[in-house]
């Protein structure tokens, strides 16, 4: 993408500032909030996107919990600390020195503590279940057509390797998309399932992160698939550590 074109923009992230100051006059884009240079040929990490979003905060997300090991993103938005690669730092703290540990998608996985809290490693979220309810249609979608279009969406719009879309389940009007990606499976350049899920979540809420003015256009054999509810469940490679007090 070069500055010789009129539109020096980032197709995959509208929350950027771009200018023709890259090598050879190439278009270079930096994430709002952090100023980190982003690769506009792929998805921007969720950590950098959340940091950018804090400059124009929106309503917090609230997710629900399907079992005792699935995490709920019920803390709302926060201004995260990201590492040089744009990943969430394992320990996050707020301005009042309250700290907690997060997983690779930035969801809290421990009780909150003080500055003495230790988070030894960033625990990977290796299984994401996206639970959707679609708006009523004349009839149910054909399952194989729906499966094919959702897989196409994740591989082409979100650039997720096809092998990471584990399954698409459908019982009208509920659609479940399972994303699986172990640490050992993720090669250099692979989109993270957490980032793909975040982009998808923002898309179905009508808050697309892509530069385009069109937003998500999801169709199954020409019939629009309109999502009216989204729940996302996160499962980590190591179960979260909450005190019993939180569970009562």
């Amino acid at each position: 993408h070069t500055a010789a074109q009129d539109n020096c923009t980032c197709p995959t992230n509208k929350m950027t500032v771009c200018s023709p100051d890259g090598p050879g006059g190439r278009c270079q884009c930096r994430a709002l909030g952090s100023g980190v240079a982003v690769d506009c040929s792929t998805l921007t990490s969720e950590c950098l996107l959340l940091k950018a979003r804090m400059s124009a905060p929106k309503n917090a997300r609230t997710l629900v919990r399907p079992n005792e090991h699935a995490l709920v993103d019920n803390d709302g938005l926060y201004d995260p600390d990201c590492d040089p690669e744009g990943r969430f730092k394992a320990r996050q703290c707020n301005q009042t020195s309250v700290c907690w540990c997060v997983n690779s998608v930035g969801v809290r996985r421990t009780d909150k503590g003080d500055l003495s809290l230790r988070c030894d490693e960033l625990v990977r979220t290796h299984h994401i279940l996206i639970d959707l309810r679609h708006r009523p249609t004349a009839g149910a979608f054909n399952h194989s057509d729906l499966d094919a279009e959702l897989r196409r969406l994740f591989r082409e719009r979100y650039r997720l390797h096809p092998k990471f879309v584990a399954a698409v389940h459908y019982e009208q009007p509920t659609i479940q998309i399972e994303l699986r990606q172990n640490t050992s499976q993720k090669a250099a350049g692979d989109v993270d399932i957490g980032d793909a899920a975040y982009y998808f979540e923002r898309d179905v809420k009508g808050e697309s992160l892509f530069q385009g003015r069109g937003g998500l256009d999801l169709r199954v054999r020409g019939e629009p698939l309109q999502v009216e509810r989204t729940l996302i469940y996160y499962l980590d490679e190591i179960p979260p550590k909450f005190s019993m007090k939180r569970l009562t």
Partner: antibody, heavy 121, light 107 residues
Framework: QVQLVESGGGVVQPGRSLRVSCIAS????????MHWVRQAPGKGLEWVAV????????DYVDSVKGRFTISRDNSKNTLYLQMNSLRGEDTAMYYC??????????????WGQGTMVTVSS | DIQMTQSPSSLSASVGDRVTITCRAS??????LAWYQQKPGKVPKLLIY???TLQSGVPSRFSGSGSGTDFTLTISSLQPEDVATYYC?????????FGGGTKVEIK
Amino acid sequence: QVQLVESGGGVVQPGRSLRVSCIASGFFFSSYGMHWVRQAPGKGLEWVAVIWYDGSNEDYVDSVKGRFTISRDNSKNTLYLQMNSLRGEDTAMYYCARGGYNSGWWAFDIWGQGTMVTVSS
Amino acid sequence: DIQMTQSPSSLSASVGDRVTITCRASQGISHFLAWYQQKPGKVPKLLIYAASTLQSGVPSRFSGSGSGTDFTLTISSLQPEDVATYYCQKFNSAPLTFGGGTKVEIK
């Protein structure tokens, strides 16, 4: 059935302009990024330009930047390539091809039959 | 810009032979590589996308492998109808460059 049909090719003098078109049918055109690819006689394939599904982003190979413009009219299921300041080296078969779903960057799963553009005095 | 280098530029093999074509990117492109087949006088046809995923309707004797910079297209048992020129293409971002092509002939 899914198809792409190009038109508008022909013989044109160097320095002149030409617009080629591609009409899509059998799929929801406005959901897909679209591309132009060309092939000079006896040569390999050369990617020319892409336009994203919603027209929000365009990219071009360096050799045509500033001379060629890709555009689309989703209401007419039509892709265009406006070629200005044509040169001898632009002589080629021009194919339109379907790219990514809700994207621009992806492999080309549907190709048109092509339209021949000859730049000659 | 990333360059795509294909080898060999041409090859001749017997029916039933295993044929391997390689494609090298000058920088890593993850899995964003496709292979196309173009028969003489015909339109290119997508064989493989995402480096190793077979396009619907393509015979299973075709397979792709690789990630990053080095990729391979294999025809496990060459058939007469496989006579064509094969191209690799990167599609991680623009420009979506093609390799120079490999012409496959029958001995």
